[in-house]
Structures are given as structure tokens and as C-alpha cells.
Amino acid sequence: ILLRAVTGFSGDGRAIWSKNPNFTPVNESQLFLYDTFPKNFFWGIGTGALQVEGSWKKDGKGPSIWDHFIHTHLKNVSSTNGSSDSYIFLEKDLSALDFIGVSFYQFSISWPRLFPDGIVTVANAKGLQYYSTLLDALVLRNIEPIVTLYHWDLPLALQEKYGGWKNDTIIDIFNDYATYCFQMFGDRVKYWITIHNPYLVAWHGYGTGMHAPGEKGNLAAVYTVGHNLIKAHSKVWHNYNTHFRPHQKGWLSITLGSHWIEPNRSENTMDIFKCQQSMVSVLGWFANPIHGDGDYPEGMRKKLFSVLPIFSEAEKHEMRGTADFFAFSFGPNNFKPLNTMAKMGQNVSLNLREALNWIKLEYNNPRILIAENGWFTDSRVKTEDTTAIYMMKNFLSQVLQAIRLDEIRVFGYTAWSLLDGFEWQDAYTIRRGLFYVDFNSKQKERKPKSSAHYYKQIIRENGFSL
């Protein structure tokens, strides 16, 4: 109430940029905090199927839009066939997980590995077996699986037949796929993520053309795709809530990614307004319908009148509250390259703590899972990844401060990534793994980097001890 009265903002995220120390939720003087995370804090690590599995056409797997995009757009990359070969070296991934001592492993299911043409008929047996084996092994190790249904590898057949996410037919097809996964894996999975970072799917897939399917400059398609992703997520949430939650007793969310931004002039109302608009246009675009009032942010509705689809009153009611926690991604994919339209002439910043405070203010202090966090190193860096350690310490410190000092309800943290792998438009020019993989080797050994040792210690101590 004080915040509202003093700042003149109705509890929204603009208060974050107020530099009056009495009212800003983030006290910049608390630079480092030696403390532990809450008891039972959920420590994990993640991968994306397309990035690490390899075997892009092995054992009956169908091509994805990314397999196609790699061959048509990324001229210097042969394929993801090499990658870390997680499909072949599952045991090595499990050993890496054992080494770090995580509480959970977040991975994604490759839709075309289960259903080569995307349509749910008889599943590809080898694909089904792979995920089933992985889940059984995790359960055996007491590692909680967090499973993402869609991490960008849409079956190519759905792109070619329907135009992919531009066509609302895909909503029901995605729901069928989700239903199958709930039926087959739901006994072992308590945490589901429907879609990983839909903002990037829409913006880079249809706006900049930097991601598959590589369409450029079609703002109407960007927002149509976003609309269909939100509706697909909502449909799957209702499906899970009605038919599976009663007996499987799990939770389901969608991972939303964002940058953070600071005003050029901290006292300037204009710049603060632009920062708010920047966050709203990226994170708010998806968070508002799902975690907010069920509709797009008002400013977007007004400005994008010719391209932003409209939710009916019934749809708004249906969208609202369709996430059991706020899954948040904060990493390089939302920063490089940053949508200049979203930047609004302000300064990007890696302040995760402030981003978490913004979420708290905008969306009524939800429970938050950091579903992806980390940075990257140049591909030439092998196991001595000091920059990655520095970034991890910085990010984790910010998360700890957010929990201890700002009373933000972060319950888990996903370090990204378990393994070096295929990094989307950057292909193999950067590395994000805590384990080094030589992509040219036969055996693809997972070698722990300094960051793996560091993260292992953080988990063991549950934070930073003096």
C-alpha cells in the first residue's frame, strides 16, 4: 500500500526504477550476501532436446523445423547429428547429473521423436523407450524430472501442412501430444512446462527470421503465433487440471523469458516509462494473459490494433491463472540480439534481482521457478570457464537477495545447461554447458568444467557460506 501511495504507480513494476531508497524494493547497497537458500530449495539443471540429443533422423525420428532450418539457413552447420549425442549417451548424462547432485533435471521431449509427423497416432517406439528409460533412471536417483513439452522443435510436417504455429489448428494437435505425454509419463513427472520461451518462438521465428522457421518482418504473424502459443498452453493446462492433476498431482506452467532494462536517466519519468513498456512488450505479452488479467497488456492492445489478435471475454476467463507457478528464463537468448523495438533506447542490464522484483509487483508475488539461467563462453573455452563461474555467482547472489531481502518466492533454480550443445542461431560458436563436450570425438565424454564444480559446491552448501 505504501508503495502505491508514494510512487503513484498502482503496484506495477515501474516502482522498480524509482531510485528513492525508501521505496524501491531493491536496495543496491546490498552487493553480496553470505547466506543460505531456504531449506528444501530446489536445485536443478536443464537441457533442450534439439540442443543435446543429436540423432536427428535415427530410429524413426521425424525432422523438426530446426533440422530443416539448419540445412537451409545455417550454412556452416552440418546438422545437430553431432551435438552431445544424449540420445546415444544417456548413461553419461546421468553420471553428470550424479556428479553435480541436483534435485531436478529439466529436459524437453522432442515432439518429432515421439510422433514423426506431429500427429498423435502410434508413437515411435524407440523414442518412447528413450524418454521412459530416462524418467525411470531419474526416479531411481531421486532426481525430480521437470519436462518441457515444446522447446522449439516443431515437427516439420506440421509446418509444411498447416503453417506451424500461425495456424490455430495446431492448438488441438499440441493438446493431443500433451495428453499422450501425460498418459505415458505423468506417473513419473510432477512438473510440466508446456512451452519454452514463446517470445523467442514468435519474435525470432517470424519477426527477425533468426530462428526456425525463419520468416522475416511479418509482425501480424509474430502476434498470431504468440496468440496461438498462449491458447495452446491454456488448453493444455485445463486439460491437465481436469483430467490428470486429480490423480497425478503435478504442477504445470510455461517458461517465460525476458531481458532486464535500466533507464538512461534514472530520475527521468520518460525513460522509466520506456523501461516499463519494454518489459511489458516482451514479458508482459505472455505473462499478462496467463499470470495477469487474461488479456494482453493494455498498451499493446492500443498500439498494435492492426496486428494483435483479440481475446474474447470467454477466452480471457480461460487464459487467466493457467500456470501453477511462474517459470522464468533469464539468459543470453533474451539479450543477444535484443529486439531493438523492445529496447526503447534504454540500457539493457543483467540484473536478475530487479527482474524478479518486477515479476513480484506485476503478478502479485507468485511462486517462481528460475527455469533457465546462466551465460555463455566462447567455443574455444574448454573446462576452465571462469566467466561462467563469475556470472553464476552473480546470478545466484541476486536470486538469494531476492529471496532473503525482497521476500520473493523463488523455490527453485535451473542452471543452464548441463552440456555443451547446439546453441540455436549461434550453432556451435558458443558453449553453455557445465560439462564440456568435444563434438568431434566419438565418445562425447562429459568433462566437468570449473562451473560444474562450483555449482556442485553451491548445492552442497545450499548457498554461500563465509
Epitope: 511479418n218 501480424a220 504473424a221 516509462f273 513498456q277 512488450s281 498498451g299 492500443k302 523495438m341
Partner: antibody, heavy 119, light 107 residues
Framework: QVQLVQSGAEVKKPGASVKVSCMAS????????INWVRQATGQGPEWMGW????????GYAQNFQGRVTMTRDTSINTAYMELSSLRSEDTAVYYC????????????WGQGTMVTVSS | DIQMTQSPSSLSASVGDRVTITCQAS??????LNWYQQKPGKAPKLLIY???ILETGVPSRFSGSGSGTDFTLTISSLQPEDIATYYC?????????FGQGTRLEIK
Amino acid sequence: QVQLVQSGAEVKKPGASVKVSCMASGYIFTSYDINWVRQATGQGPEWMGWMNPYSGSTGYAQNFQGRVTMTRDTSINTAYMELSSLRSEDTAVYYCAKYNWNYGAFDFWGQGTMVTVSS
Amino acid sequence: DIQMTQSPSSLSASVGDRVTITCQASQDITKYLNWYQQKPGKAPKLLIYDTFILETGVPSRFSGSGSGTDFTLTISSLQPEDIATYYCQQYDNLPLTFGQGTRLEIK
């Protein structure tokens, strides 16, 4: 730099049609809507509608529905506005304007095309 | 349609004066308002968007304020080059509508 260059002045008889062109340069033509606004002498501007150059989709103000058609030719980065069944009250300067999504405003305008409707 | 009413319709001021132009909307438009400057024989030029944000290159003597139905454009110290007609425009609802204009001249 961004430029919108419109076709020259037109004199038309009542009942005829006029087609005004607007050639864009200095930005990616298909990435921003082109809107058309007209202004009669001594009056405030009047919004006529929008056209998305990427898809060709359009939206027209009620006052012009059925009489206006907005099109484009992406190969030459040009937008067109055709107004039919002209009457004397359509005499005005017609402007094309680039719509900036971030602002919710027209950040660049053409120089205007004077259309005179007279018998 | 939302009607935009500007006042005064014309005003005369001296160089260095503080000048205020108001714009009233026929219904609540929150903050979805822009201001344009138009010089004789020229196209309108964007000055301010979202009620108070100055377009790049616009001198800081221009400022905007207001919310709901009442909005103001202020020139803190009038300069000779500010002689023009000023228009407000709402984008809260389609159709987009403009005010009838305020003509500013030097005394």
C-alpha cells in the same frame, strides 16, 4: 533516412476515382503499417485507415468503408490509396504516414497530395 | 467515435512566453494521446507520444501531461520557430481521431 514520397496533385470530377501513391524508403517497408490521413483546408486531420504492407490486410474508418481501397506493391515499396465515388467534400490534402508500433503514433509522413474534386 | 476538442482554437503569444494548449477527449482515453506540429504547407510532425514522451530531436521546451480526458501541451519558452498549428490525436479506440487544432502565432 526514412522518406515517404507521394504522387502529384490531382483534379477529379464528382463520381470519379483517384489513386494516390506513396513510395517508402529508408526502412523495411513490410515491417510497419502505412496509414492514410486526409486534411481539408482549415480542418484537423481525418484518419482513413491502415494497411499492413507485409500481408496486404487493411482496416478502414467507417466513414470511408466501401469507397476506399488500400493496396501495396512490395517490389517497389509503394502503398496506394484509391478513393471512389468522389464528391466535392473529398477535396483535401491526402497524406500517407508510417505507423510506429512502439509509439502508437505516426512518426513519418508523406509530403501530401492535393486532390481537388470539382465539376 | 471519440471527439477531441482543443482549446483555444488560436492563440497569440510573445517569444519567451510559456504557452499551454489543452485537449479534451469525449471519453476516458487513459494516456493514449499524441501531439503533432504542423507548419503551413507541410505535413504534420510528431512531437509527443504517450501523453508525455518527447520524440527524438524535439526540443525539451515542449512537454506533455494529463490523463483520462484532459491533456496539456506546454511550451516553456516560446521560440519563433514554434509558430505552427498543433493537433492532439487519440489512439485509445478506432477510429483514430484528431483535434481540430490550435493555431499559434507570435504577438
